[in-house]
Amino acid sequence: MRTEAQVPALQPPEPGLEGAMGHRTLVLPWVLLTLCVTAGTPEVWVQVRMEATELSSFTIRCGFLGSGSISLVTVSWGGPNGAGGTTLAVLHPERGIRQWAPARQARWETQSSISLILEGSGASSPCANTTFCCKFASFPEGSWEACGSLPPSSDPGLSAPPTPAPILRADLAGILGVSGVLLFGCVYLLHLLRRHKHRPAPRLQPSRTSPQAPRARAWAPSQASQAALHVPYATINTSCRPATLDTAHPHGGPSWWASLPTHAAHRPQGPAAWASTPIPARGSFVSVENGLYAQAGERPPHTGPGLTLFPDPRGPRAMEGPLGVR
């Protein structure tokens, strides 16, 4: 759920106006406090449905609940990509869709949700206990992934409710971006409150700003998502894996990550890996990916409308860097 709060406009301090300064000193902490409390993490939900008509046909729907711009969605099966999973599709808002059999009809449903139909026969077909994972790369939140599978007792035609599955991963872009700002804000807030204790109460003066204040947008986790935090993470079952998959190792990375210092960049790769920690059998987990967006102001590669990461239209090959990123 998105919460919107009206916040008084903050003016630059004017010398000699202790009262006004005091007023602003009081307002700023509350703004920061509101952000600290209400800024919930983004979420990814995954819904897996087996079609009643064809037992080998699945529909996977995934969505991203967050305020950022989606730049790339990766759908995999058999577990998260880079932790034994195999890429089924990648979707970019502008550059289009790429899908690997048995994926069919990957498409955008909205600007923040996608669907994918899987059709297969024999070795390449999915089965009821397959785990499907969706990873959303967005700016500024970073990369977030959740997995889901059909409940064991699912009848064909039924589907698991859309689980805002536990957020599995956040990369450094998100953590250093949003979280960093919030952390700084919270620390600053504590500093201000501490200072405020040792000062006389300031005289309140009317703010000289227009009545129409800017709106500060913050995200609060929904009830559904809070409940989801208690849902155990589905055990990845490898008995129904793509026949063509050898053991996957977390190496490589998408070629659209721009050049970064080696210690700070991990390029996820096409149908390749997104680094992750081992997956526990039960319980949710969060792992931090060693990946940063090339430039903080830029949105990632392909997915939501109007996004691009490389300044060079040739994309991946434009800039060769320390990690082979163009």
Epitope: R95, R98, Q99, A248, G253, Q269, A272, L323
Partner: antibody, heavy 119, light 107 residues
Framework: QVQLQQSGAELARPGASVKLSCKAS????????ISWVKQRTGQGLEWIGE????????YYSERFKGKATLTADKSSSTAYMQLTSLTSEDSAVYFC????????????WGQGTSVTVSS | DIQMTQSPSSLSASLGQKVILTCRAS??????LNWLQQEPDGTIKRLIY???SLDSGVPKRFSGSRSGSDYSLTISSLESEDFVVYYC?????????FGGGTKLEIK
């Protein structure tokens, strides 16, 4: 600069196997995939499959499952394709091509390896 | 599988002439289409990627465009080295598929 160097021509007996190689240079091997493509004499191009050495994700065209096996050696930046149970239908030139798995598909190509199956 | 129907299969043209080669996709492939050039010695080179983007080092006389499910490669003024074989490639849905090729011959 990016280069894909393929192994030399092969002459094999029916029923035998051959293993073709594609050595990559000029880029980070694990950041891209290698696709393999078949071209019979005077005919068009046909995709066999691809391997992503960074994750060992492997994909095959249905037509080539059981015929081709793709592997990669990260230490030597080399991709391999083994063709088994060879018949005259497998006589062709086989190309490898680089692919990023996103939107830079088959941007660089090897020079091709000719395979002739004859008794 | 997505079928790519390329036409014409062969084309005779003169130096300096403008030619247009086309590929039709049996399903929606968005902009995920490349044009490749194959020399007589077998060497394959990508000319155009993502429907209309020119690869580096490729002469500006080559251009790509799309109209619905029809994709075109235009050579604005033929030069002697252009008389080779051209293929289109879709890479939106595996198996990736190629057009049957167009052999460009000098008239």
């Amino acid at each position: 600069q990016v280069q894909l160097q393929q192994s030399g021509a092969e002459l094999a007996r029916p029923g035998a196997s051959v293993k073709l190689s594609c050595k990559a240079s000029g880029y980070t091997f694990t950041n891209y995939g290698i696709s393999w493509v078949k071209q019979r004499t005077g005919q068009g191009l046909e995709w066999i499959g691809e391997i992503y050495p960074g994750t060992i994700n492997i994909y095959y065209s249905e037509r080539f499952k059981g015929k081709a096996t793709l592997t990669a050696d990260k230490s030597s930046s080399t991709a391999y394709m083994q063709l088994t149970s060879l018949t005259s239908e497998d006589s062709a030139v086989y190309f490898c091509a680089r692919d990023d798995g996103y939107y830079d598909a088959m941007d660089y190509w090897g020079q091709g390896t000719s395979v002739t199956v004859s008794s | 599988d997505i079928q790519m129907t390329q036409s014409p299969s062969s084309l005779s043209a003169s130096l300096g002439q403008k030619v247009i080669l086309t590929c039709r996709a049996s399903q929606d492939i968005g902009s995920s289409l490349n044009w490749l050039q194959q020399e007589p010695d077998g060497t394959i080179k990508r000319l155009i990627y993502a429907t209309s983007s020119l690869d580096s080092g490729v002469p500006k006389r080559f251009s790509g465009s799309r109209s619905g499910s029809d994709y075109s490669l235009t050579i604005s003024s033929l030069e002697s080295e252009d008389f080779v074989v051209y293929y289109c490639l879709q890479y939106t849905s595996s198996p990736w598929t190629f057009g049957g090729g167009t052999k460009l011959e000098i008239k």
